[in-house]
Amino acid sequence: KVILDKYYFLCGQPLHFIPRKQLCDGELDCPLGEDEEHCVKSFPEGPAVAVRLSKDRSTLQVLDSATGNWFSACFDNFTEALAETACRQMGYSSKPTFRAVEIGPDQDLDVVEITENSQELRMRNSSGPCLSGSLVSLHCLACGKSLKTPRVVGVEEASVDSWPWQVSIQYDKQHVCGGSILDPHWVLTAAHCFRKHTDVFNWKVRAGSDKLGSFPSLAVAKIIIIEFNPMYPKDNDIALMKLQFPLTFSGTVRPICLPFFDEELTPATPLWIIGWGFTKQNGGKMSDILLQASVQVIDSTRCNADDAYQGEVTEKMMCAGIPEGGVDTCQGDSGGPLMYQSDQWHVVGIVSWGYGCGGPSTPGVYTKVSAYLNWIYNVWKAEL
C-alpha cells in the first residue's frame, strides 16, 4: 500500500490507478477530474478590502467606496458587533478585542462614526463630529507574543519559545521551506516552494518544535498562490496554506501578526530571520536546529544598484541583511518570516530569493507582506 500510495493515485468511478506524476499536471486523467482537484490553486488579487488597521495603535480605518477616501473610525457608538464585522471583512473568524484611544493632534485622516450595512462597515450618514475624541483600536487576533525574547547577536541557535509561529513545510517528510502561523487555520509561506510539487496531498506542516524531525505533521487542505505575473516573474512570491484542522495554540504554537498596511520600515531598522536552511552557500547541510539571526532593512536603492540586483527588486519586495554581509537566509529558509518587533512581532517579509547567501552587495530579498494584505484578506474571506 505504501508503494502504491507513493507512486500511484487512485481515481474513483471507475476505480483505477494513475501515475502520481500525472497529479496536478493540468490534464484531467481521472474521469471525474479529481487528479486536478487537490492542487495548488491560484487566487486573484481581488477587490480592495474596505477596512484596514494602522500602525498608529492598530486604529481602524474605513474606505468610502464612493470617493475612494479612507477615514478613521470614531469610537462613538462603536460596538462588539461592529468590531466583529470589521474583522470578518478582513477574513478573521476569531473574537476581536477593541478599545478607545485618544485622537492625536497629528491625526491625518478625517474621523467618522461607523455603522454596518450588509455585513460591511460604512460611514454613518450625517453623523456629528467625534464627541469622544477617541479612535477605535482593534485587534482581530491575539498574535505576535512569544515566551522568550531573542538576544541581539549575529547567528545563533533558536528556541521555539522565541518563535512559536515558525513551521517546517515538508514534502514527503523532507523539509522544503519555512512558514509562519497566521491564525489557527492558515500558514504563510512563499509560492516558489510549490513549484516542483503542486499536489496538496504530500505536503505537511510541522509546528511546535525547533528540531526538524521531532514534531507531528499536520495535514494540509489547500495551498493558494497569486496568479503568475509574467511581467514581474519574481513578484507575488507568497502562498497561504490552509490546514485541514485548526491548530490549538500553546506556548510553542502561536500566530505572528500581519504587518499594518502603513508599516514602512526605514533602512537600518532591526529585523530577525529564522530557518533550518543550508548553513553554507552551495553546500553544507540543512540545519537540524532552528537558527536565528538579526539583520536590518537595506535601502531598495542600494539593493537595486549595479553591483547588486540591478533593478530586479520591485516595490513588492524588500531587502534585508547586514551591510558588510555574512548574515543571510539561504536555501531551505525560503517561505520563512522576516520579522519586526514593535509591541508584537510582525511578519513583514517572506524569505524569497537572492544571489548566493550572505554576500555583502547581494542581501536577501523578501516578499513585502504589507503589499499583499488585500490578497490575504480576500483569500481568508473566500474561505470563511
Epitope: 485622537i103 492625536g104 493632534p105 491625526q107 478625517d110 474621523v111 450625517s126 453623523s127 456629528g128 463630529p129
Partner: antibody, heavy 121, light 107 residues
C-alpha cells in the same frame, strides 16, 4: 470645495447686540466643529468658542461667558454668533472657522472671510 | 488659561533668508500646536498642525518642530509671498489660545 460665507459688516452702538452668520457649503455641515475667532484692528487673534453643529452644544472662552451665544440652523447649514452688551473694545473682525478633521482639538483649516463689527456711539 | 508667547514680535529679512520664529507655552501642551500665516485683510491660513505636520498644499520650505513648551516655525528660504504675520495656537486645553504674532517684513 469647502466654503464659509459670512454676513456683511455691522455698526452697533455700545450696549447693543450683534448677530453674525456663517453659511457653510461643500461638506457635511453636521460633521465638523465650528469655532469663532476675533481680531481687533491691528491686534492678534483671540479665540472665542466652539459649536457642535450636530448637537448644538457649545463651549465659550471664560472672557465671553454670559455675553456670547452660538447657534445653528441645520436646514440652511448656517452657524450664528451673537455678542451682547457691546462695548468699544468689541470692535473687531469676527471669523468663523471649521476644524481640519471632525474633532474639537483639531486646528481650524477653513475660515470665513471675516465680518467687521464696529461698536461706536 | 495657557499663555502663548512668541519671539521675536517682528523681524526684518530678505528673500532667500532662513527665518526662525519661536513660540512658548506657559505649560506643557505636548504637540497640540498649530502655526498660521496671516496677510493684511485676509483670514489666517493653516501652515502646520501637531507641531510638525505640514498642512497639504503648504510649501515644504515651512517646517515646525518642538514638543512640550517650546516650539519653532522655520522658513528655510524666505520667498516674497512669505512676508506676513505668523501666529501659533495651542489646542491642548480650552480656551485654545493664540500667541501674539510675529510680523515678518522686508529688510
Amino acid at each position: 470645495q469647502v466654503q464659509l460665507v459670512q454676513s456683511g459688516a455691522e455698526v452697533k452702538k455700545p450696549g447693543a447686540s450683534v448677530k453674525v452668520s456663517c453659511k457653510a457649503s461643500g461638506y457635511t455641515f453636521t460633521s465638523y466643529y465650528m469655532q469663532w475667532v476675533r481680531q481687533a484692528p491691528g491686534q492678534g487673534l483671540e479665540w472665542m468658542g466652539w459649536m457642535n453643529p450636530n448637537s448644538g452644544n457649545t463651549g465659550y472662552a471664560q472672557k465671553f461667558q454670559g455675553r456670547v451665544t452660538m447657534t445653528r440652523d441645520t436646514s440652511t447649514s448656517t452657524v450664528y454668533m451673537e455678542l451682547s452688551s457691546l462695548r468699544s473694545e468689541d470692535t473687531a473682525v469676527y471669523y468663523c472657522a471649521r476644524v481640519r478633521i471632525g474633532w474639537l482639538q483639531s486646528p481650524p483649516l477653513y475660515w470665513g472671510q471675516g465680518t467687521l463689527v464696529t461698536v461706536s456711539s | 488659561d495657557i499663555q502663548m508667547t512668541q519671539s521675536p514680535s517682528s523681524l526684518s529679512a530678505s528673500v532667500g533668508d532662513r527665518v526662525t520664529i519661536t513660540c512658548r507655552a506657559s505649560q506643557g501642551i505636548s504637540n497640540y500646536l498649530a502655526w498660521y500665516q496671516q496677510k493684511p485683510g485676509k483670514a489666517p491660513k493653516l501652515l502646520i498642525y501637531a507641531a510638525s505636520s505640514l498642512q497639504s498644499g503648504v510649501p515644504s520650505r515651512f517646517s515646525g518642530s518642538g514638543s512640550g513648551t517650546d516650539f519653532t516655525l522655520t522658513i528655510s528660504s524666505l520667498q516674497p509671498e512669505d512676508f506676513a504675520t505668523y501666529y501659533c495656537q495651542q489646542s491642548y486645553s480650552i480656551p485654545f489660545t493664540f500667541g501674539p504674532g510675529t510680523k515678518v517684513d522686508i529688510k
